[in-house]
């Protein structure tokens, strides 16, 4: 769920998601359109695709709560719970580490980026 994602991103990146990523660029935060603005934005676009896939599989992506462990900088998704819970954790883990990998190219100007400026082809999943 969204609480899992926020906590995980904060633990992995050290940034408060609500201040740094939701929203950011054209794809971080709710919704998404156009060409991603940078590598961080690409992380979110890929994450949107991951969620879209789970939605087609019938998963409640915003409601499902999963268990995971954060230890020594790594995320271990628990193998407990339902198929959806496990897959959701995998999606969130991937975006958290993607955002961390791209901290060096994070652009403050893309924080609260005006979505009408998001043009171009929205990448397919």
């Amino acid at each position: 769920g969204i609480l899992n994602l926020n906590k995980m991103v904060k633990q992995v990146t050290g940034k408060m998601p609500i201040l740094s990523y939701w929203p950011y660029g054209c794809h971080c935060g709710l919704g998404g359109r156009g060409q991603p603005k940078d590598a961080t934005d690409w992380c979110c676009q890929t994450h949107d695709c991951c969620y879209d896939h789970l939605k087609t599989q019938g998963c409640s992506i915003y409601k499902d709560y999963y268990r995971y462990n954060f230890s020594q900088g790594n995320i271990h998704c628990s193998d407990k719970g339902s198929w959806c819970e496990q897959q959701l954790c995998a999606c969130d883990k991937e975006v958290a580490f993607c955002l961390k990998r791209n901290l060096d190219t994070y652009q403050k100007r893309l924080r609260f980026y005006w979505r009408p400026h998001c043009r171009g082809q929205t990448p397919g999943c």
């Epitope: 019938g58 193998d79 407990k80 339902s82 959806c84």
Partner: antibody, heavy 120, light 106 residues
Framework: QVTLKESGPGILQSSQTLSLTCSFS??????????VSWIRQPSGKGLEWLAH???????RYNPSLKSRLSISKDTSRNQVFLKITSVDTVDTATYYC????????????WGQGTTLTVSS | QIVLTQSPSIMSASPGEKVTISCSAS?????MYWYQQKPGSSPKPWIY???NLASGVPARFSGSGSGTSYSLTISSMEAEDAATYYC?????????FGSGTKLEIK
């Protein structure tokens, strides 16, 4: 080889508390990934999952019965327990314990079941 | 929770006849699991991850499906196949079972 066996009171009066025991062998609940569920089946009817306990003592309950259920384990004695409070005639059923490994999403070994009759 | 609806609820088949039992999910699931239960016995795992036969299950059984529609098929009915079959999902919490299909031999 994996075996599970349930035991219980057989007959209870309405409003009493049901205590069930699942004794198992062939695996350990201290092994990561292992878990045991309780599942019930009223006579001539379908199966209803009740609760699950994991190797690390994490627990899950059926939301529709959560307030009445309590699952626990004794790892050293290879036993899992289920308590159901305030039983009623609708709780009359055969109660099974079954094993599930977390990486799989089904119950691979089942006990023979123990029958409960609740009289009003 | 996901509701699994099995059809038919009861059916009979002659030896050698092809049998198909259906399981419909109220929302999409990734995999379906099937159990066989005979009177006085506990359910036995029969098919896992939609199409894989559990150990000891005869090759005349098969499973298929995706999304909300799944089925168990017996290519040629035999007397020992008379039983009740249940589908089950743990795609999302809580795990749920179908109401069962009782298969009788003619």
């Amino acid at each position: 080889q994996v075996t599970l066996k349930e035991s219980g009171p057989g007959i209870l009066q309405s409003s009493q508390t049901l205590s069930l025991t699942c004794s198992f062998s062939g695996f350990s609940l201290s092994t990561s990934g292992m878990g045991v569920s309780w599942i019930r089946q009223p006579s001539g009817k379908g199966l209803e999952w009740l609760a699950h306990i994991y190797w690390d003592d994490d627990k899950r309950y059926n939301p529709s019965l959560k307030s009445r259920l309590s699952i626990s384990k004794d790892t050293s004695r290879n036993q899992v327990f289920l308590k159901i409070t305030s039983v009623d005639t609708v709780d009359t059923a055969t109660y099974y314990c079954a094993r599930r490994e977390s990486k799989y999403f089904y119950f691979d070994y089942w006990g023979q079941g123990t029958t409960l009759t609740v009289s009003s | 929770q996901i509701v699994l609806t099995q059809s038919p609820s009861i059916m009979s088949a002659s030896p050698g006849e092809k049998v198909t039992i259906s399981c419909s999910a109220s929302s999409s699931v990734s995999y379906m699991y099937w159990y066989q239960q005979k009177p006085g016995s506990s359910p036995k795992p029969w098919i896992y991850r939609t199409s894989n036969l559990a150990s000891g299950v005869p090759a005349r059984f098969s499973g298929s499906g995706s999304g909300t529609s799944y089925s168990l098929t017996i290519s040629s009915m035999e007397a020992e196949d008379a039983a009740t079959y249940y589908c089950q999902q743990y795609h999302s919490y809580p795990p749920t079972f179908g109401s069962g299909t009782k298969l009788e031999i003619k």
